[in-house]
Interface confidence: low
């Protein structure tokens, strides 16, 4: 029997301090360029080496960003999301959704993913 791939979804508040090259990550998504089918959310596409996000270590490629400084990122055009990040200030609070892949055992013997990571 093959194992089944499940996902453990967790949310986290990440506070970043803007560095010389900004927040140090790229985003994809938005109502005009959906990254995930039927989801216009904003996702992290790349963490820049030695950038603010990389040095903090918590943000991961593939994470979904739910809000920036309390501002919901739902139903935004991609460019508006980009500008929201650019104008977010020096200290930036991100509400992030991590989607961790969990390889379970054979069906009927499901392993448990440890959310403490």
């Amino acid at each position: 029997m093959n194992g089944r791939v499940d996902y453990l979804v967790t949310e986290e508040e990440i506070n970043l301090t803007r560095g010389p090259s900004g927040l140090g990550f790229n985003i994809v998504g938005g109502t005009d360029q959906q990254y995930v089918s039927n989801d216009s959310g904003i996702y992290v596409s790349r963490i820049k080496e030695n950038g603010a996000a990389a040095l903090d270590g918590r943000l991961q490629e593939g994470d979904k960003i739910l809000s920036v400084n309390g501002q919901d990122l739902k139903n935004l055009l991609h460019q508006d999301a980009v500008d929201l990040f650019r104008n977010a200030g020096y200290a930036v609070s991100l509400r992030v959704q991590h989607r961790l892949q969990v390889q379970n055992g054979p069906i009927g013997h499901r392993g448990e993913g440890d959310p403490s990571g």
Epitope: D32, Q79, D83, L84
Partner: nanobody
Framework: QVQLVESGGKLVQAGGSLRLSCAVS??????MGWFRQAPGKEREFVAA????????VYADSVKGRVTISRDNAKNTVHLEMNSLKPEDTAVYYC????????????????????WGQGTQVTVS
């Protein structure tokens, strides 16, 4: 891709009226402005409207003669111009604020990152 397309410019008699329109795509929730540039002169601020449409700002030179409005459902911004004078002759440009949901309307060219190609207004 951000696009601003102006329309409505034409030759009009002094004292006449005109309605300029700007179709916006690629950005939303932006303060929007109209600027103009007469031959041999610098581009100058005419009017601006907040992203929500609830506040407006006008240049002294057009106050009382010009009304800026927006239709967010149709992503358009309008500039209604009355009692036109020969000195209103210029290319009129629509512009979108570079800041997302900016709290305060700016009149400075530098705040407006996205520009249309312009529409010619000639008052004879």
């Amino acid at each position: 891709q951000v696009q601003l397309v102006e329309s409505g410019g034409k030759l009009v008699q002094a004292g006449g009226s005109l309605r300029l329109s700007c179709a916006v795509s690629g950005v939303s929730f932006r303060n929007m402005g109209w600027f103009r540039q007469a031959p041999g002169k610098e581009r100058e601020f005419v009017a601006a409207i907040s992203w929500s449409g609830d506040s407006t700002v006008y240049a002294d030179s057009v106050k009382g003669r010009v009304t800026i409005s927006r239709d967010n459902a149709k992503n358009t911004v309008h500039l209604e111009m009355n009692s036109l004078k020969p000195e209103d002759t210029a290319v009129y440009y629509c512009a979108a604020d570079g800041r997302f949901r900016a709290g305060r309307i700016g009149t400075s060219l530098g705040l407006y990152h996205y520009w249309g190609q312009g529409t010619q207004v000639t008052v004879s």
